[in-house]
């Protein structure tokens, strides 16, 4: 009957392991895009929103060509752990305006956790150190207002979307080199 649903497939093929991480990343990317679009429909955004506590975007011009697998996986895992904290914070402190998106935020959190587990597995298979974040974890205080939580949600979903795009592109590029 095969392994139970959701359990990692045992494999010694790094390409297959990478493939399964890419699949989860792409699924999460699609979910994030959909949720960001819902957010824009319900709470139209006026321009770009940022949040100081979010990780800086991992990719800039020229960096993709020189990527190495350990660096990508470590950076991705650290960044996604930060986004997971931010999604948890949104669900906890987002206030009544974001309550309507609770099922979607819950599903997004579950997918993020699943991807993080898969990355952890991949890193242990490749004998990579499970790095802790370099920068100290900034405590997330309650949003200043209802509008503040909406702006934070736009920033979190937008940043996560771009981070996941970087991840898919980086991981697929690395797969071609394996």
């Amino acid at each position: 009957p095969g392994p139970p649903a959701g359990s990692p497939r045992v494999s010694s093929d790094p390409r297959a392991d990478l493939d399964s991480a890419v699949l989860l990343t792409r699924s999460l990317l699609a979910d994030t895009r959909q949720l960001a679009a819902q957010m824009r429909d319900k709470f139209p955004a006026d321009g770009d929103h940022s949040l100081d506590s979010l990780p800086t975007l991992a990719m800039s011009a020229g960096t993709l060509g020189s990527l190495q697998l350990p660096g990508v996986l470590t950076r991705l895992r650290v960044d996604l752990m930060s986004y997971l904290r931010h999604v948890q914070w949104l669900r906890r402190a987002g206030g009544p305006s974001l309550k309507t998106l609770e099922p979607e935020l819950g599903a997004l959190q579950a997918r993020l956790e699943r991807l993080l587990r898969r990355l952890q597995l991949l890193m242990s298979r490749l004998a990579l150190p499970q790095a802790a974040p370099d920068q100290p974890v900034i405590p997330l205080g309650p949003p200043a207002s209802a509008w503040g939580s909406i702006r934070a949600a736009h920033a979190i979903l937008g940043g996560l979307h771009l981070t996941l795009d970087w991840a898919v592109r980086g991981l697929l590029l690395l797969k071609t080199r394996l």
Partner: antibody, heavy 119, light 111 residues
Framework: EVQLVQSGAEVKKPGASVKISCKAS????????MDWVKQAPGQRLEWIGD????????IYNQKFTGRATLTVDKSASTAYMELSSLRSEDTAVYYC????????????WGQGTTVTVSS | DIVLTQSPASLALSPGERATLSCRAS??????????IHWYQQKPGQAPRLLIY???NLASGVPARFSGSGSGTDFTLTISSLEEEDFATYYC?????????FGQGTKLEIK
């Protein structure tokens, strides 16, 4: 209306370089990747590479690595593709196309730029 | 790289008939829940136009007579009842891995 408008046709000598522009309008430029596709006479369409306008990080088809350079000017919502060391096989129509993040399907295309390489 | 082979190379049909175009991949382009195949239409002197994405999703503004199906290595684009403006060349494309590649095309001609 969502549109990609490309620069005009070019005629170049072998060994030269060409730089094509692609001006986006009608959507948020940084919400999609910009991809470039080559269509040579009698050949199948060929993906050259793409760039994420938000972060500026390009990726390339290995076949074009080292000769193609993709850049963006975010403030002008314009993407560029430069192709160097031109040879006759580079004679083709080059398209820019809007790419869905992480999925590489292209839902909006420029009108194409014809590049002719001839001595 | 994944190679996509389209068949037939050309097809002559009359308006009102049903068209079935095939695309076969050299390895599976599906993974649980997703099939990374997309279909485009191109007319002479024009850019390609996206018809179907992720195997079966109709792109914005595309008539409902177009549909896509398949999984694994075998995919089909179906036009249920041909209209005059449907006579063109059709390409499939995958995005399962990098680089994305295209099929060689199927030319749909008026009989």
């Amino acid at each position: 209306e969502v549109q990609l408008v490309q620069s005009g046709a070019e005629v170049k000598k072998p060994g030269a370089s060409v730089k094509i522009s692609c001006k986006a309008s009608g959507y948020t430029f940084t919400d999609y990747n910009m991809d470039w596709v080559k269509q040579a006479p009698g050949q199948r369409l060929e993906w050259i590479g793409d760039i994420n306008p938000h972060q500026g990080g390009p990726i390339y088809n290995q076949k074009f690595t080292g000769r193609a350079t993709l850049t963006v000017d975010k403030s002008a919502s314009t993407a560029y593709m430069e192709l160097s060391s031109l040879r006759s096989e580079d004679t083709a129509v080059y398209y820019c196309a809007r790419g869905e993040l992480g999925h590489w399907y292209f839902d909006v295309w420029g009108q194409g730029t014809t590049v002719t390489v001839s001595s | 790289d994944i190679v996509l082979t389209q068949s037939p190379a050309s097809l002559a049909l009359s308006p009102g008939e049903r068209a079935t175009l095939s695309c076969r991949a050299s390895k599976s382009v599906s993974t649980s829940g997703y099939s990374y195949i997309h279909w485009y239409q191109q007319k002479p002197g024009q850019a390609p136009r996206l018809l179907i994405y992720l195997a079966s999703n109709l792109a914005s503004g595309v008539p409902a007579r177009f549909s896509g199906s398949g999984s694994g290595t075998d995919f089909t684009l179906t036009i249920s009842s041909l209209e005059e403006e449907d006579f063109a060349t059709y390409y499939c494309q995958h995005s399962r891995d990098l680089p994305p590649t295209f099929g060689q095309g199927t030319k749909l001609e008026i009989k």
